[in-house]
């Protein structure tokens, strides 16, 4: 049967009575050593009758005395079997054994839950020698017990390669409930059920759980640990905690906030990072996410021109990295830009609108209807064209660039001419006779040079030829016109 000793009990006697051989309470031990490294050498002296043996692991010595009497079996004496005490209290327990003095090499070690206790434990082994036996008392003390000290403690002694094991001493450290699982903060959908878990352990058991929501108990009846609370749904933020009760008192878990997912707040601080003729790079600071991660964002772009049709272009992008390059915009145009982001609940309102402008760009099309003809009287080539549509000029025209390439046998030379934006004709001097002149024209704005027109070729004959027809930009599909006069 287990002997229970509670913390308020009187100190346990080390033995049922004095040792045979008249060992008295004032009898000081011959040797008292602190327990270092788990093993303690025992010094043996003259034997007397050993104490009451236990039923555990017993060593039967094979050696006989001078009178050839067989020695009785060696065993640890019975001691208290179960010690119950509160956390942070001190405890001391011991093993005792009487060993015939003929054994010179004995060691006692302490074990807890099958593992040897080594090092800095408070273990002391005391030796009380008598004529034929030495009483050995191995004491183990813990000054302030913790839950981790719970367990089964035994002594082991080795004699002549035989192992003697004591009965276990069960240490049960009791205290307030200890949480092994506490509720976690969550973000939940409005009016949707969710679960919270709370688990606490003793000893002592049982541990009962009460749930608390916004300082009010959810259950007036205790629930055995572990407890799962199904919250039927919330319409507003709430704080939950759980109380764990046992015979020692109660422990309260951390309070956790349960937030209700909502649509996000609109983004703020939409700003222009960079503008080009056809794109605007914007950034924004996301608003509050409504307790639900952002999924994506929508950039809304409106032409700010009061004469525009007011249509809105929408560009969808990922929520990160709060940056987006809006493309396919017109050059030298004004736009209103707003940003909205969404989470699983829905879309935020649109951010405050900001105004942004694209810069001047190089024209996107070449001049049209390019015509070239030879004016032999002045030894010039006359070039005419139509300027590109205003929409596609992508800025204010500052002029044109004319490329004319002269090719004759084995010679090729390209010349560039810049002409002002007024007018749509130019005259260039003939550079080489008996050669082909290839002309291309590009419109120019402050944003750069636009694409060149398709090449128009004219043959410049040797001196003396009279009849010249113009050469012009071909109709589509006529790739390389050559006018030979």
């Amino acid at each position: 049967a287990i002997t229970e000793a509670r913390e308020e009990a009187k100190p346990y006697p080390l033995f049922p009575g004095p040792f045979p051989g008249s060992l008295q309470t004032d009898h000081t031990p011959l040797l008292s050593l602190p327990h270092a490294s788990g093993y303690q050498p025992a010094l043996m002296f003259s034997p007397t009758q050993p104490g009451r043996p236990h039923t555990g692991n017993v060593a039967i010595p094979q050696v006989t005395s001078v009178e050839s009497k067989p020695l009785p079996p060696l065993a640890f004496k019975h001691t208290v079997g179960h010690i119950i005490l509160s956390e942070h209290k001190g405890v001391k327990f011991n093993c005792s054994i009487s060993v015939p003095n003929i054994y010179q090499d004995t060691t006692i070690s302490w074990w807890k839950d099958g593992k040897e206790l080594l090092g800095a434990h408070h273990a002391i082994t005391q030796f009380y020698p008598d004529d034929e036996v030495t009483a050995i008392i191995a004491s183990f003390s813990i000054t302030s017990v913790q839950r981790s000290d719970n367990g089964s403690y035994i002594c082991k002694m080795k004699i002549n390669n035989e192992e003697i094991v004591s009965d276990p001493i069960y240490i049960e450290v009791q205290g307030l409930p200890h949480f092994t699982k506490q509720p976690e903060s969550m973000n939940v959908t409005r009016n949707t059920a969710f679960n919270l878990t709370c688990q606490a352990v003793g000893p002592p058991e049982p541990v009962n759980i009460f749930w608390v929501q916004n300082s009010s108990r959810v259950n007036e009846q205790p629930e055995k640990s572990p407890s799962v609370l199904t919250v039927p749904g919330l319409t507003e933020m709430a704080v939950f905690s759980c109380e764990a009760h046992n015979d020692k008192g109660l422990t309260v878990s951390k309070g956790v906030q349960i937030n209700i997912k909502a649509i996000p707040s609109p983004p703020t601080e939409v700003s222009i990072r960079n503008s080009t003729a056809h794109s605007i790079l914007i950034s924004w600071v996301p608003g509050f996410d409504g307790y639900s991660p952002f999924r994506n964002c929508s950039i809304q772009v409106k032409e700010a021109d009061p004469l525009s049709n007011g249509s809105v272009m929408i560009f969808n992008t990922s929520a990160l990295p709060h940056l987006y390059q809006i493309k396919q915009l017109q050059a030298l145009a004004n736009y209103s830009i707003g940003v909205s982001c969404m989470n699983e609940i829905g879309w935020s309102a649109v951010s405050p609108w900001i105004l942004a402008s694209t810069t001047e760009g190089a024209p996107s099309v070449a001049p049209l209807n390019v015509t070239v003809f030879l004016n032999e009287s002045s030894d010039n080539v006359d070039i005419r064209w139509m300027k590109p549509p205003t929409k596609q000029q992508d800025g204010e025209l500052v002029g044109y660039r004319i490329s004319h390439v002269w090719q004759s046998a084995g010679i090729s030379k390209e010349l560039l001419e810049e002409v002002g934006q007024n007018g749509s004709r130019a005259r260039i001097s003939v550079q080489v006779h008996n050669a082909t002149c290839t002309v291309r024209i590009a419109a120019v704005t402050r944003g750069g040079v636009g694409p060149f027109s398709d090449p128009v070729k004219i043959f410049i004959p040797a001196h003396g030829w009279v009849d010249y027809a113009p050469s012009s930009t071909p109709a589509p599909g006529n790739a390389d016109p050559v006018l030979i006069i």
Epitope: S216, V218, N219, P232, G233, T235, A238
Partner: antibody, heavy 118, light 105 residues
Framework: QIQLVQSGPELKKPGETVKISCKAS????????MSWVKQAPGKGLKWMGW????????TYADDFKGRFAFSLETSASTAYLQINTLKNEDTTTYFC???????????WGQGTTLTVSS | QIVLSQSPVILSASPGEKVTMTCRAS?????MHWYQQQPGSSPKPWIY???NLASGVPARFSGSGSGTSYSLTISRVETEDAATYYC????????FGGGTKLEIN
């Protein structure tokens, strides 16, 4: 299945005592609290109080302190409502109803009609 | 204690109609529960924790609300819905509303 079965109708004289029982079955009796609810003929519901079936501690609504007593016989999974010194106005139907979390009465007894008349 | 006021006291409807009854609390409550009581029977749990239907309650019933204002709605009334409906809170001391009697024409 879960059931709350109440004792039968009672006819009492003013000044007498009555004890109404509510026997629970189909669940662990000590897990759920037990409330008592009064309903006068043709009237609404009025909460009288409850008893903690785990600890046995009763709680009474303000209007039911004094002559009313809740008790338990846990081994029989039974809750009791005792009314002392009966008055004519105690004539009504009494319901037991169990609850756990969020104090929602998920099962009700069939009701016990008490008539107090001289 | 928290007083619950139900309106209307009597509600008449024809089968197929949508009806709503309300329950107002004298101060804010966390959850509202609703019970249905047919004449001569004990109350039955109908809606718990504001919006959750009790076992066996038809999906045409719904509950909503927060703070001090709660409601029970029947999307298409049927004759078997004729009963008295009580709201109930236990945020303070438990109280019941006076009931709304639903009559089917």
């Amino acid at each position: 299945q879960i059931q709350l079965v109440q004792s039968g109708p009672e006819l009492k004289k003013p000044g007498e005592t009555v004890k109404i029982s509510c026997k629970a079955s189909g669940y662990t009796f000590t897990t759920y609290g037990m409330s008592w609810v009064k309903q006068a003929p043709g009237k609404g519901l009025k909460w009288m109080g409850w008893i903690n079936t785990y600890s046995g501690v009763p709680t009474y609504a303000d209007d039911f302190k004094g002559r009313f007593a809740f008790s338990l016989e846990t081994s029989a999974s039974t809750a009791y409502l005792q009314i002392n010194t009966l008055k004519n106005e105690d004539t009504t139907t009494y319901f037991c109803a169990r609850f756990l979390r969020y104090y929602y009465f998920d099962y009700w007894g069939q009701g016990t009609t008490l008539t107090v008349s001289s | 204690q928290i007083v619950l006021s139900q309106s209307p006291v009597i509600l008449s409807a024809s089968p197929g109609e949508k009806v709503t009854m309300t329950c107002r609390a004298s101060s804010s409550v966390t959850y509202m529960h609703w019970y249905q009581q047919q004449p001569g029977s004990s109350p039955k749990p109908w809606i718990y924790a504001t919006s959750n239907l009790a076992s066996g309650v038809p999906a045409r019933f719904s509950g909503s609300g927060s703070g001090t204002s709660y409601s029970l709605t029947i999307s298409r009334v049927e004759t078997e819905d004729a009963a008295t409906y009580y709201c109930h809170q236990w945020s303070g001391n438990p109280t019941f509303g006076g009931g709304t009697k639903l009559e089917i024409n």
